[in-house]
């Protein structure tokens, strides 16, 4: 599987997340349609449903076994790790900030009377 | 959970990955100790072993149920998505920001205060 390349400042891994997945992430882990109590966390099926929503390429309608879902989860984590293991591009420098004129050292001011003869 | 902050050009999400985990990621799914064919991934136990290797905070020695492993996997995926949704560090002066970064749409920025519980 190829590494995910930057697309418009984000990455395919992120850009291909469904709006639904992003909405769930924003909603502190709550699916928009359900407000279930924490006790249901122990239900394995809920975890698989959650993974289906989070991982691109695991659409809800498809019939995937738990093993197939886990395989796609593993692939997705590997892709995210590969992208993040490469440092983000950075700028060459910060903005140019002038030295305060009052603090200019003598060496930085070229005197006009030393411009005439080649020593 | 707090947002993952840049650390020396990489991110805590990556920095906290064990060397082994990164080596696995670079090897595109091959554990350093085993060169198993992909067919073995069909075994559910192999998938969980693999996830234990890939996800920080799921050490091999600990006794975690499959549900607990999946919960940590979900948390980790959400964290990686959050980091990738954040634009790369840029120069402090706005006008010089490259178009890619400046064009990041709000929908791509995932809220940082999410928790992943399997709802």
């Amino acid at each position: 599987m190829k590494a995910l390349s930057p697309v418009r400042g984000c990455y395919e891994a992120v850009c291909c997340l469904s709006e639904r997945s992003l909405a769930i992430a924003r909603g502190r882990g709550k699916s928009p349609s359900t407000e279930e109590p924490l006790s249901l966390l122990d239900d394995m099926n809920h975890c698989y449903s959650r993974l289906r929503e989070l991982v691109p390429g695991v659409p809800r309608g498809t019939q995937l076994s738990q093993v197939e879902i886990l395989q796609r989860v593993i692939d997705y984590i590997l892709d995210l790790q590969v992208v993040l293991a490469e440092p983000a591009p950075g700028p060459p420098d910060g903005p140019h900030l002038p030295i305060q004129t009052a603090e200019l050292t003598p060496e930085l001011v070229i005197s006009k009377d030393k411009r005439s003869f080649c020593h | 959970m707090k947002a993952l902050s840049p650390v020396r050009g990489c991110y805590e999400a990556v920095c906290c990955l064990s060397e082994r985990s990164l080596a696995i990621a670079r090897g595109r799914g091959k554990s350093p100790s085993t060169e198993e064919p992909l067919s073995l991934l069909d075994d559910m136990n192999h998938c969980y072993s693999r996830l234990r290797e890939l996800v920080p905070g799921v050490p091999r020695g600990t006794q975690l149920s499959q549900v607990e492993i999946l919960q940590r996997v979900i948390d980790y995926i959400l964290d990686l998505q959050v980091v990738l949704a954040e634009p790369a560090p840029g120069p402090p002066d706005g006008p010089h920001l490259p178009i890619q970064t400046a064009e990041l749409t709000p929908e791509l920025v995932i809220s940082k205060d999410k928790r992943s519980f399997c709802h």
Epitope: G90, P95 | P98
Partner: antibody, heavy 111, light 111 residues
Framework: QSVEESGGRLVTPGTPLTLTCTAS????????IHWVRQAPGKALEWIGY??????TYYASWAKGRFTISKTSSTTVDLKMTSLTTEDTATYFC???????WGPGTLVTVSL | AVLTQTPSPVSAAVGGTVTISCQSS????????LSWFQQKSGQPPKLLIY???KLESGVPSRFKGSGSGTQFTLTIIDVQCDDAATYYC????????????FGGGTEVVVK
């Protein structure tokens, strides 16, 4: 406003060495600091920088052997490992914008 | 990226004009992130021009920078004896490493 390098000395190959850039008249929390070196009679060579926020970037040749870190609001270190004779040079630090440079500190790597 | 400067040395007469070129193998950041420095023996570099054409404070207006993208020029008009030095261009790039690269330097000899 000025910067000054220190820590340069004669070392044998393989010896690690740490140089320090000390800022006067401004805080490093607001500026990038660059490290640049110049071998005798050779061109300037950019090593890397640490940003105001602490992010570091390096020349590809310097990655792994050179580490830049902020040690206080007025000091930045350049840690160098696995030094060879090729690393003999005057090492400069420069403030963001490259408009303030230190006088440089000489590092000599010799047997 | 690689920055290639006019071969050294370049000779000029007092009152004459000197042109030094700097070519980058890839476009600099923002198409203008290129600086020029003057360095005299035993001294740190001194910033003359930044962002291709902006004159640093205290630098005589005889120094002019121009160019865009990959091709840049430093022009010194009404050359003075004090201009005898080595001149370096510095390209900046938005990248994961080698964010700043110096040219090889051009020595200017004033006759």
């Amino acid at each position: 406003q000025s910067v000054e390098e220190s820590g340069g000395r004669l070392v044998t190959p393989g010896t690690p060495l740490t140089l320090t850039c000390t800022a006067s008249g401004f805080s490093l929390s607001s500026y990038y600091i660059h490290w640049v070196r110049q071998a005798p009679g050779k061109a300037l060579e950019w090593i890397g920088y640490i940003s105001d926020g602490g992010t570091t970037y390096y020349a590809s040749w310097a990655k792994g052997r050179f580490t830049i870190s902020k040690t206080s609001s007025t000091t930045v270190d350049l840690k160098m490992t696995s030094l060879t004779t090729e690393d003999t040079a005057t090492y400069f630090c420069a403030r963001q914008g490259f408009n303030i440079w230190g006088p440089g500190t000489l590092v000599t790597v010799s047997l | 990226a690689v920055l290639t400067q006019t071969p050294s040395p370049v000779s000029a007469a007092v009152g004459g004009t000197v042109t030094i070129s700097c070519q980058s193998s890839q476009s600099v950041y923002n198409n203008n992130w290129l600086s020029w420095f003057q360095q005299k023996s035993g001294q740190p570099p001194k910033l003359l021009i930044y962002e291709t054409s902006k004159l640093e404070s205290g630098v005589p207006s005889r120094f002019k920078g121009s160019g865009s993208g990959t091709q840049f020029t430093l022009t010194i008009i009404d050359v003075q004896c004090d201009d005898a030095a080595t001149y370096y261009c510095l390209g900046g790039y938005w990248t994961t490493s080698d964010n700043n690269i110096f040219g090889g330097g051009t020595e200017v000899v004033v006759k």
